[in-house]
Amino acid sequence: TPEVWVQVQMEATELSSFTVHCGFLGPGSISLVTVSWGGPDGAGGTKLAVLHPELGTRQWAPARQARWETQSSISLALEDSGASSPFANTTFCCKFASFPEGSWESCGSLPPSSDPGLSAPPTPVPILRAD
């Protein structure tokens, strides 16, 4: 069964900077990745970035840079502008659309006791949906 992992990391050098790493574990080719915060996109979350393997990427503030790390994983850098976007307490979700599997989504957040540079373990959240 395909799985999605999500890893949220606070940058050691800049405490206001976060990076979300997501990956797809499974066969098939990725056709689209959507990253959201505050919950799944379409269920109260806010879209942060869309990555397409051929057409490029699109991001919305406070996302700074979305990029492919491998053919099945992406990273998204975020700039926390202060109280209006408290990323430390936020859930980030990644949805991978792949052919022929369909869509798979998981969410993750920074562990409450995280030190800078540490990150959530790259494990999928099993409760979320596969469309």
Partner: antibody, heavy 117, light 106 residues
Framework: QIQLQQSGPELVKPGASVKISCKAS????????IAWVKQRPGQGLEWIGW????????MYNENFKGKATLTVDTSSSTAYMQLSSLTSEDSAVYFC??????????WGQGTSVTVSS | DIVMTQSQKFMSTTVGDRVSITCKAS??????VAWYQQKPGQSPKLLIY???NRYTGVPDRFTGSGSGTDFTLTISNMQSEDLADYFC????????FGAGTKLELK
């Protein structure tokens, strides 16, 4: 087909407020951002802010913080922009546009706001 | 803020010409650039996204190129219906537009 229908022209007095609407049809409203853009006569385009329709999350151009307030009514697939404490500098055409992966791919027809005593 | 500079406010052209409109970003925006066409009394229309991708239904005489800080919109065979204002836009960080370039007949 996809459409963004904006409310009609407004003539308002200095110091007053105005609320412009942008009704979307033909697509899943909550999957997209709506961007608002200002264009003064004979001038370029200035981004005011975004609202994500699935969550109501807003992001503003610093120049419009305190001037513009973006809201959404998902039940009627309508986005709103309220402009407050109007001056002659706010006289312009205001556009709403769907902001998607492909940049701003659908635009409303524009709403003219004239501030005059 | 990222500033998008369109150095030519006006360009004179004739039907059949090859026209190149340039736009320079104040910092690296990758390929997060779009081009819009606006005719008097109308709303802007998307022509190009991601610097070089032609939007659905846009004639193939319109091409976009560039990355980083320098971008170009080229109309390879100018038609009278192409007389309009053209705006570049970056969407790497928030949104900013160029001041526009107006195409006029010679």
């Amino acid at each position: 087909q996809i459409q963004l229908q904006q409310s009609g022209p407004e003539l308002v007095k200095p110091g007053a407020s105005v609320k412009i609407s942008c009704k979307a049809s033909g697509y899943t409203f909550t999957d997209y951002y709506i961007a608002w853009v200002k264009q003064r006569p004979g001038q370029g385009l200035e981004w005011i802010g975004w609202i994500y329709l699935g969550s109501g999350h807003t992001m503003y151009n610093e120049n419009f913080k305190g001037k513009a307030t973006l809201t959404v009514d998902t039940s009627s697939s309508t986005a709103y922009m309220q402009l407050s404490s109007l001056t002659s500098e706010d006289s312009a055409v205001y556009f709403c546009a769907r902001d998607s992966f492909y940049a701003m791919d659908y635009w409303g027809q524009g709403t003219s706001v004239t501030v005059s005593s | 803020d990222i500033v998008m500079t369109q150095s030519q406010k006006f360009m004179s052209t004739t039907v059949g010409d090859r026209v190149s409109i340039t736009c320079k970003a104040s910092q690296n925006v990758g390929t997060a650039v779009a081009w819009y066409q606006q005719k008097p009394g109308q709303s802007p229309k998307l022509l190009i996204y991601s610097a070089s991708n032609r939007y659905t239904g846009v004639p193939d005489r319109f091409t976009g190129s560039g990355s980083g800080t320098d971008f170009t919109l080229t109309i390879s065979n100018m038609q009278s219906e192409d007389l309009a204002d053209y705006f570049c836009q970056q969407y790497s960080t928030y949104l900013t537009f160029g001041a526009g370039t107006k195409l006029e007949l010679k």
